[in-house]
């Protein structure tokens, strides 16, 4: 019962066929983040809306406790945008002792957690120095790429400073994944 | 005639199978925007090239009058990049009465219009304050995510200021969607 | 033996079906760039890791000599992020003779090379003026879109200044493509 087709010049046997509408998929949208303790030197994870408005999970892709749970092994396209906003950054202040300041920055990391593996894996990182003078600032960081994931892997989005995340609109800050 | 395959441990019936090459797809590229009147407090929509150069529409995905028309229901990945360019921004000017200036900004919105629904839905937004001193500036905003769309839905790209869009090259400003 | 399915109201014949797991795919990650000569007025191409860590190529998608080689014709989603980093840009310095400075900038181009065609085709470009004062700076440029490619086409990523590319982490700078 394996799917068969004619390749350009010969018959070829492929892996079992699969209807696209049945594949695990999720698009999560921002909600206001409740302040929580997080470990020093570890970026906090965002939590997400998974069923209201534009958000959804389908075909066994589940969201629980800040994680997207991967229900089957395969190649997934994973993406996120986080919009940050803040007040004037100090990066252009006069430098002490001739050294440039360490700039303010904003960072988004999409992280994979595998229970059988002790350390999380950083899949994608977007990081940007922020040097805005004289006004409030706001800007997005977008990430997206394809990764081979295993059933049971968990995905989360971590940010450098949860208090700078713009949680006001579901179209500004979001996180998604789909099996290819 | 439903598509069948062996799941890891049991036979499973899926939705009808579908050849990937037959799915609705479009990649549209920038053209110069002719100045046109638009409603106050409403971001103007960009119009696009749909058949020359890198641009194409296929498999019943049609482009007409600034809209991509969705020909069948399903989950689509939708993306756009808009490159903006302008001259020195005023955001670093001395602030009156100790208040920061309202910064200049650039915004891209991918919008869904459903005829049976009175209000357009903002699917994706990228918005960025612009604070550049001493020179002309240019920068892209990229957006992309997956959404469940219905047959007949229409997609457009709106921008905060059409006069700042870099229309010079098809690889700088573009808009696309494809059925997953 | 063509793939068949029931359309909503009538039987329709599609192109041959294809198992998704069999499609050409690649995700390449950054490695340190060895300085090489490149032609004046031509952006240098990055080279990539293709098998260690998060990087992979599969199903006849091969990487060789800075190029991804497209093994079969079809519509591909292509993406890349390049993180740049540098020291203070001079764009806000006092301008000589009242003229604005030409701004510093960073640019990423995803380029297609077709052996039968004399000129490379720029598929995607992300370009950004850099005007940071008082500190070191870093920032990503992300690109992604869908293109119709032919068997034998080659893809590469070019950058405006190879010495500004952040090669330190595989999640910061990457390049990928997959057949839809």
């Amino acid at each position: 019962l394996k799917g068969q087709e004619f390749a350009p010049s010969h018959q070829q046997v492929y892996a079992p066929l699969r209807a696209d509408g049945d594949k695990p998929r999720a698009h999560l949208t921002v909600v206001r983040q409740t302040p929580t303790q997080h470990f020093k030197n570890q970026f906090p994870a965002l939590h997400w809306e998974h069923e209201l408005g534009l958000a959804f999970t389908k075909n066994r892709m589940n969201y629980t406790n800040k994680f997207l749970l991967i229900p089957e092994s395969g190649d997934y396209f994973i993406y996120s945008q986080v919009t940050f906003r803040g007040m004037t950054s100090e990066c252009s202040e006069i430098r002490q002792a001739g050294r440039p300041n360490k700039p303010d920055s904003i960072t988004v990391v999409i992280t994979k957690v595998t229970d059988s593996y002790p350390e999380p894996t950083q899949l994608l990182m977007g990081t940007k120095s922020v040097c805005e003078v004289g006004s409030n600032w706001f800007q997005p960081i977008y990430l997206g790429a394809m990764f081979s994931l295993q059933e049971g892997d968990k995905l989360m989005v971590n940010v450098s400073d949860i208090s700078l995340v713009d949680y006001t609109k579901e179209d500004k800050t979001f996180f998604g994944a789909f099996l290819l | 005639l439903k598509g069948q395959e062996f799941a890891p441990s049991h036979q499973q019936v899926y939705a009808p199978l579908r050849a990937d090459g037959d799915k609705p797809r479009a990649h549209l590229t920038v053209v110069r925007q002719t100045p046109t009147q638009h409603f106050k407090n409403q971001f103007p929509a960009l119009h696009w090239e749909h058949e020359l150069g890198l641009a194409f529409t296929k498999n019943r995905m049609n482009y007409t009058n600034k809209f991509l028309l969705i020909p069948e229901s399903g989950d689509y990945f939708i993306y756009s990049q808009v490159t903006f360019r302008g001259m020195t921004s005023e955001c670093s000017e001395i602030r009156q009465a100790g208040r920061p200036n309202k910064p200049d900004s650039i915004t891209v919105v991918i919008t869904k219009v459903t005829d049976s629904y009175p209000e357009p839905t903002q699917l994706l937004m990228g918005t960025k304050s612009v604070c550049e001193v001493g020179s002309n500036w240019f920068q892209p905003i990229y957006l992309g995510a997956m959404f469940s769309l219905q047959e007949g839905d229409k997609l457009m790209v709106n921008v905060s200021d059409i006069s700042l869009v870099d229309y010079t090259k098809e690889d700088k400003t573009f808009f696309g969607a494809f059925l997953l | 033996l063509k793939g068949q399915e029931f359309a909503p109201s009538h039987q329709q014949v599609y192109a041959p079906l294809r198992a998704d797991g069999d499609k050409p795919r690649a995700h390449l990650t950054v490695v340190r760039q060895t300085p090489t000569q490149h032609f004046k007025n031509q952006f240098p191409a990055l080279h990539w890791e293709h098998e260690l860590g998060l990087a992979f190529t599969k199903n006849r998608m091969n990487y060789t000599n800075k190029f991804l080689l497209i093994p079969e014709s079809g519509d591909y989603f292509i993406y890349s992020q390049v993180t740049f980093r540098g020291m203070t840009s001079e764009c806000s310095e006092i301008r000589q003779a009242g003229r604005p400075n030409k701004p510093d900038s960073i640019t990423v181009v995803i380029t297609k090379v077709t052996d039968s065609y004399p000129e490379p085709t720029q598929l995607l470009m992300g370009t950004k003026s850099v005007c940071e004062v008082g500190s070191n700076w870093f920032q990503p440029i992300y690109l992604g879109a869908m293109f119709s490619l032919q068997e034998g086409d080659k893809l590469m990523v070019n950058v405006s200044d190879i010495s500004l590319v952040d090669y330190t982490k595989e999640d910061k700078t990457f390049f990928g493509a997959f057949l839809l």
């Epitope: - | 110069r32 925007q33 002719t34 100045p35 046109t36 009147q37 638009h38 106050k40 903006f84 360019r85 302008g86 001259m87 002309n136 200021d161 059409i162 006069s163 700042l164 869009v165 870099d166 229309y167 010079t168 090259k169 | -």
Partner: antibody, heavy 117, light 107 residues
């Protein structure tokens, strides 16, 4: 630095065709539209039309039937032809760079064209 | 076509004084309005675009305001080199059009 330089005859006879060229230097020619604007003596400015490196043009409808703007990317120059001229076409003709979009941030110094027999 | 009407035709002021120039459009042009300065025998120079954004290299004494149909160019304190003719230009609809100009002269 970006420079624009108009050239062409300063005197044209009525009913003939006015021809001007603008040479551009100091910038990537393909990244912009390039425009022609004119100014009759002692009067205001009038937009004539513009072009990009692919030859796409926009014209003022009031002049469209008589205007042709063309481009030569190999020489970094673009040209204006205005046919069937009359005394009303006497003006200083400027070429200019369109940046960011329908705004003119760099101009040539202008060349006076007089239509007279 | 959209008509732009500038007022006054001539403005007589002394150095150090504040100049306020008006431009009115025959229909809304949103914020798609630019201001230029032109001195005798010279090409126009872009001052303001987007109704209120200063062009690169333009001194802070020049500012623009307005939206829709009514726009203002303000020179906060006139310098000797500011005495010139000023034009507004709309780019909300084709064809692009200019106002007839306001001359700022020394009193």
């Amino acid at each position: 630095e970006l420079q624009l330089q108009e050239s062409g005859p300063g005197l044209v006879k009525p009913s003939e065709t006015l021809s001007l060229t603008c040479a551009v230097s100091g910038v990537s020619f393909t990244d912009y539209h390039w425009a022609w604007i004119r100014q009759p003596p002692g009067k205001g400015l009038e937009w004539i039309g513009d072009i990009n490196h692919r030859g796409h043009t926009n014209y003022n409808p009031s002049l469209k039937s008589r205007v042709t703007v063309s481009i030569d990317t190999s020489k970094n120059q673009f040209s204006l032809k205005l046919s069937s001229v009359t005394a009303a076409d006497t003006a200083v003709y400027y070429c200019a760079r369109d940046y960011p979009n329908f705004i003119y941030d760099y101009w040539g110094q202008g060349t006076l064209v007089t239509v007279s027999s | 076509d959209i008509q732009l009407t500038q007022s006054p035709g001539t403005l007589s002021l002394s150095p150090g004084e504040r100049a306020t120039l008006s431009c009115r459009a025959s229909q809304s042009v949103s914020n798609y309005l630019a201001w230029y300065q032109q001195k005798p025998g010279q090409a126009p120079r872009l001052l303001i675009y987007g109704a209120s954004r200063r062009a690169t290299g333009i001194p802070a004494r020049f500012s623009g305001s307005g939206s829709g149909t009514d726009f203002t160019l303000t020179i906060s304190s006139l310098e000797p080199e500011d005495f010139a003719v000023y034009y507004c230009q709309q780019y909300a609809a084709s064809p692009l059009t200019f106002g007839q100009g306001t001359k700022v002269e020394i009193k």
